[in-house]
Interface confidence: low
């Protein structure tokens, strides 16, 4: 289709080489309430249309995105050629930065309902470049945290080194919706609620003698609870003794709840005490089985191929730790009465003899 009639917008993405960040393009078609898509008579190619906060309504249009190759080749369908660019309804999401994202991106409605709609399209000329190292060291992150229940602010990364007085007028979007209440380089939140979480976009205009560009940055905002003041608690095992059958396999699960910490380095391990010896056991990796706003439950299992007589004299200890402190839970194995016949006992003794030899050659004091 002919893109000469598309309205045009120039955008600049100055990405930080120090951190991961995303970028978003909106398909700024005019609101369907004002016109059916965009009748050419109502929108000249130079006009920048009102931004449409697209929702999931079935009544609103899906759009198709294309990239225009610089060599004049035909338009490329983004879904086929660029796996790191995600088309989500009326936004285009760039998952990774890089100058190779520089180019022209065109969007238009998938459904063309009248001859006037053919020229209904927006062309976005995107220039991508790494931020100069001269930029200030304390520039705002593209991932920002807000503490639930407290006052907080969201800063525009590309302007965070400038004072509020110096800062140009900023346009903010939240979830693709225009935020009209602020024009500052930061949004002040009087009280943080969970719905403040999400994707924010800040735009400002940068002009030189030749042309005018919209400088855009994307901020992922997370609402968090305060760091826990508690050490982790062990949810399982609850009992300090466990009835087992000799010669049978056994899995003991340790589950612990860790309170939220911004810098989260949980420790969870099993070790065994046997008389005056103590050693850490090689067990499968710990896994997170439940993650909520306030805490995370982590599980790690110790697996015994066959329970031996020696295991009955040992103590199995689950040890968990966060930055506040540690917690342990000990488990002693106890033979189930009347669980097996003579064969089971002989088998268990044979296993124990092999295990004793292996134990003596492999284990030493745990420091």
């Amino acid at each position: 289709f002919n893109i000469s009639g598309c309205s045009t917008k120039k955008l600049l993405w100055a990405y930080s080489t120090r951190s991961e960040e995303e970028f978003i393009l909106f398909c700024d078609l005019p609101e369907p309430q004002k016109s059916h898509f965009c009748h050419r008579s109502q929108l000249s190619p130079t006009q920048v249309p009102d931004h449409l906060p697209f929702t999931d309504s079935k009544d609103l249009p899906d759009v198709q995105w294309y990239r225009q190759p610089s060599n004049g080749d035909p338009l490329e369908d983004i879904r086929k050629s660029y796996p790191h660019i995600i088309q989500d309804k009326c936004t285009l999401r760039f998952l990774t930065p890089g100058v190779n994202n520089t180019g022209s991106y065109i969007c238009r409605p998938k459904m063309i309902k009248s001859p006037y709609d053919v020229a209904c399209c927006v062309k976005m000329i995107l220039e991508v470049k790494p931020q100069s190292n001269a930029s200030c060291e304390n520039s705002a992150s593209h991932k920002q945290d807000l503490l639930l229940g407290s006052t907080g602010s969201i800063s525009c990364p590309s302007l965070s080194c400038q004072s509020d007085a110096q800062s140009p007028e900023v346009t903010w979007y939240k979830n693709g919706k225009l935020l009209s209440m602020t024009r500052s380089n930061r949004i002040v939140v009087d009280e943080v609620y969970i719905y403040h979480q999400g994707t924010y976009v800040c735009d400002y205009t940068q002009s030189d003698t030749a042309s005018s560009w919209t400088v855009r940055a994307v901020v992922q905002v997370r609402t968090i609870v305060g760091d826990t003041k508690l050490k982790p608690d062990i949810l399982d095992p609850v009992e300090s003794t466990l009835e087992v059958e000799l010669g049978k396999p056994l899995t003991i699960s340790c589950k612990a709840r860790f309170g939220f910490e911004r810098v989260f380095n949980p420790v969870m391990k099993w070790y065994i005490k046997d008389a005056d010896l103590e050693w850490e056991v090689s067990v499968p990796e710990a896994k997170s089985i439940k993650s909520t706003l306030k805490d995370e439950i982590i599980e790690r299992n110790i697996i015994l191929e066959k329970v031996t007589q020696r295991d009955l004299r040992r103590t199995f200890v689950c040890f968990v730790q966060n930055s506040i402190g540690n917690t342990t839970q000990s488990v002693q194995l106890k033979e189930k009465r009347g669980s097996g016949g003579l064969n089971d006992i002989f088998e268990a003794q044979k296993i124990e003899w092999h295990e004793t030899v292996r134990f003596q050659s492999h284990h030493h004091h745990h420091h």
Partner: antibody, heavy 123, light 107 residues
Framework: QVQLQQSGPGLVKPSETLSLTCTVS????????WTWIRQPPGKGLEWIGY???????NYNPSLKSRVTISVDTSKNQFSLKLSSVTAADTAVYYC?????????????????WGQGTTVTVSS | AIQLTQSPSSLSASVGDRVTITCRAS??????LAWYQQKPGKAPKLLIY???NWESGVPSRFSGSGSGTDFTLTISSLQPEDFATYYC?????????FGQGTKVEIK
């Protein structure tokens, strides 16, 4: 398609405990909040409270002393108990799923509702 | 608790009319407001969340607007199936509260 099926007695005697159960079908009970709401005859809606899949609860302060909401993830069910009922507790009781919708952002919505159970408190 | 006051309590309108219902919060709730439609003997149905976002499948004749304390639900062209009671609900702070409802009747 997630559906909520309510069950429980339609008639409860004063001072007794009202018990209702909501069974979730066509989807998991995990990763959502599960809510109870009531509507007295000819009146508006009143939020009773919620329970998360992990068992954390939040109740309306006006009912807190009498309400217990519990969850049984193995049965995909959650339940409401309201003790010491009076005629003022006569209402249609609804269970609902409270979702945190992610559209690049978080919003709470009550997007799936049970059919409602009419509970009359009378001797 | 945050109180929500809807106005009017009831209104009579004809098919094709533009209908506006307002909801006022006793304190600022940002955009944390939802609108529901309820028909007699049925459970409420979500129409709008976050003050202005359509729930999936809701016709575009329903629209929501507002922020802070004043919110509006507009039905641009009333259809026969739109005669019902409409409730607003805040999701800003616990306990969640509802408006008293606005009944839209056939003129």
């Amino acid at each position: 398609q997630v559906q909520l099926q309510q069950s429980g007695p339609g008639l409860v005697k004063p001072s007794e405990t009202l018990s209702l159960t909501c069974t979730v079908s066509g989807g998991s009970i995990s990763n959502y909040y599960w809510t109870w709401i009531r509507q007295p005859p000819g009146k508006g809606l009143e939020w009773i409270g919620y329970i998360s899949d992990s068992g954390s609860t939040n109740y309306n302060p006006s009912l807190k002393s009498r309400v217990t909401i519990s969850v049984d993830t193995s049965k995909n069910q959650f339940s409401l108990k309201l003790s010491s009922v009076t005629a003022a507790d006569t209402a249609v009781y609804y269970c609902a799923r409270e979702t945190i919708v992610v559209r690049g952002f978080y919003f709470y919505v009550m997007d799936v509702w049970g059919q409602g159970t009419t509970v009359t408190v009378s001797s | 608790a945050i109180q929500l006051t809807q106005s009017p309590s009831s209104l009579s309108a004809s098919v094709g009319d533009r209908v506006t219902i307002t909801c006022r919060a006793s304190q600022g709730i940002s955009s944390a407001l939802a609108w529901y439609q309820q028909k007699p003997g049925k459970a409420p149905k979500l129409l709008i969340y976050d003050a202005s976002n359509w729930e999936s499948g809701v016709p575009s004749r329903f629209s929501g607007s507002g922020s802070g304390t004043d919110f509006t639900l507009t039905i641009s062209s009333l259809q026969p199936e739109d005669f019902a009671t409409y409730y607003c609900q805040q999701f800003n702070s616990y306990p969640w509260t509802f408006g008293q409802g606005t009944k839209v009747e056939i003129k």
